[in-house]
Amino acid sequence: MMTGTIETTGNISAEKGGSIILQCHLSSTTAQVTQVNWEQQDQLLAICNADLGWHISPSFKDRVAPGPGLGLTLQSLTVNDTGEYFCIYHTYPDGTYTGRIFLEVLESSVAEHGARFQIP
C-alpha cells in the first residue's frame, strides 16, 4: 500500500533571467527512492537515478543544473518556462509518487513597474 505523500513548493514565481529551485519531498513512507524524474507535460527535463546518476535532457543542458539534493535548478528563465513541472518519484516497493509545481516567470521590468506605480 502507498502511504507516502509528496510535498512540493506548489505555485511559485520568478523573474525572467533569474533562476529557481524546483523541489519535491517524499514523506510518510519507508520506501526506497530509486529514481526521480523531473518532467514537463511534453518532455523529460532530467532524471536522477540511484545507479546511473543524473541525466539532463540535451535541450535543457545549458540552463538546468542538478540539485540541490533531488531537486532541480532552472537558470536563465524565460517567459516560455511558465507552466507545470512534475516530479515523479520511483520507489521500491511502493511504486510511483507524483508532485506538481506551477512556475510563473514574470517580466522583471513589469514587476518593477508594477511595484513603483501602485495606486494606493
Epitope: N37, E39, Q41, Q43, L44, I47, N49, H55, F86
Partner: antibody, heavy 117, light 107 residues
Framework: EVQLVQSGAEVKKPGATVKISCKVS????????IHWVQQAPGKGLEWMGY????????KYNVKFKGRVTITADTSTDTAYMELSSLRSEDTAVYYC??????????WGQGTLVTVSS | DIQMTQSPSSLSASVGDRVTITCKAS??????VAWYQQKPGKAPKLLIY???YRYTGVPSRFSGSGSGTDFTFTISSLQPEDIATYYC?????????FGAGTKLEIK
C-alpha cells in the same frame, strides 16, 4: 477504479468526419492528459495526440496533417477525438489512454472505425 | 522524432523458455522506455515503465533493462498466457513513438 469507456464502432464514407468519445471515471479528469492511439488492422500502435483537460492544451502527431482534433468536456469527464477527410487507410481501432504523463496504465476498450465507400 | 527499432518482429518459443526482445532508440532517451503486452482484440497493457519498473500487478517473470539507446525486455519463463504482441514505447518526449511490435508464439 479507473475506467475509460469509448463510444461504439463507426462506418464512414471517404471524405467524411468521425468523432469518438472517451468517458473517464475513477480519477480527477483534469489531473492527467488523455492520449489517442491508432492501430490499423494487423499493424502497430501510432500516437495521434493528446489533450490536457486542466487547461485545454493539445498536441498532435504531424502525420495526421491537421486532420485530427482532440477536445475535452470537463462537465462530463469526456474526451473526444475527431478525424476528418477520412480515407481507407484510416480504417483502424482507435484507443484513448491515460496514465503518468507519457506512459499509459489505462486504456479504453477501443473503437473500430471502418472507412468504406 | 525518436525512432524505436524493435527486434525480432516475431519469435517462437516453448513454455518455460527465457524470451528476450530488444528495442533501440534513435537517440538517447536515458531510461524513458515502456513495454506493453497486447492480446488479439484487446487494448495494450502496461508491463514496464522507465525501462525497468514493473507496473502494479505485473508478474515478476517480466522484466526490463537498459538505458541510453539500447533496451531489453525479458520473460524469464514463458507461460502459455504470455502469447501476445509486445511493444516498446519511448516516453522521453512528444511525439511519442512505439516499436513495430514483436509477435510471440508458442512452439
Amino acid at each position: 477504479e479507473v475506467q475509460l469507456v469509448q463510444s461504439g464502432a463507426e462506418v464512414k464514407k471517404p471524405g467524411a468526419t468521425v468523432k469518438i468519445s472517451c468517458k473517464v471515471s475513477g480519477y480527477t479528469f483534469t489531473d492527467h492528459t488523455i492520449h489517442w492511439v491508432q492501430q490499423a488492422p494487423g499493424k502497430g500502435l501510432e500516437w495521434m495526440g493528446y489533450i490536457y483537460p486542466r487547461d485545454g492544451s493539445s498536441k498532435y502527431n504531424v502525420k495526421f496533417k491537421g486532420r485530427v482534433t482532440i477536445t475535452a468536456d470537463t462537465s462530463t469527464d469526456t474526451a473526444y477525438m475527431e478525424l476528418s477527410s477520412l480515407r481507407s487507410e484510416d480504417t483502424a481501432v482507435y484507443y484513448c489512454a491515460t496514465g503518468m504523463l507519457r506512459w499509459f496504465a489505462y486504456w479504453g476498450q477501443g473503437t473500430l472505425v471502418t472507412v468504406s465507400s | 522524432d525518436i525512432q524505436m527499432t524493435q527486434s525480432p518482429s516475431s519469435l517462437s518459443a516453448s513454455v518455460g523458455d527465457r524470451v528476450t526482445i530488444t528495442c533501440k532508440a534513435s537517440q538517447d532517451v536515458f531510461t524513458a522506455v515502456a513495454w506493453y503486452q497486447q492480446k488479439p482484440g484487446k487494448a495494450p497493457k502496461l508491463l514496464i515503465y522507465s525501462a525497468s519498473y514493473r507496473y502494479t500487478g505485473v508478474p515478476s517473470r517480466f522484466s526490463g533493462s537498459g538505458s541510453g539507446t539500447d533496451f531489453t525486455f525479458t520473460i524469464s519463463s514463458l507461460q502459455p498466457e504470455d502469447i501476445a504482441t509486445y511493444y516498446c514505447q519511448q516516453h522521453y518526449s512528444i511525439p511519442l513513438t512505439f516499436g513495430a511490435g514483436t509477435k510471440l508464439e508458442i512452439k
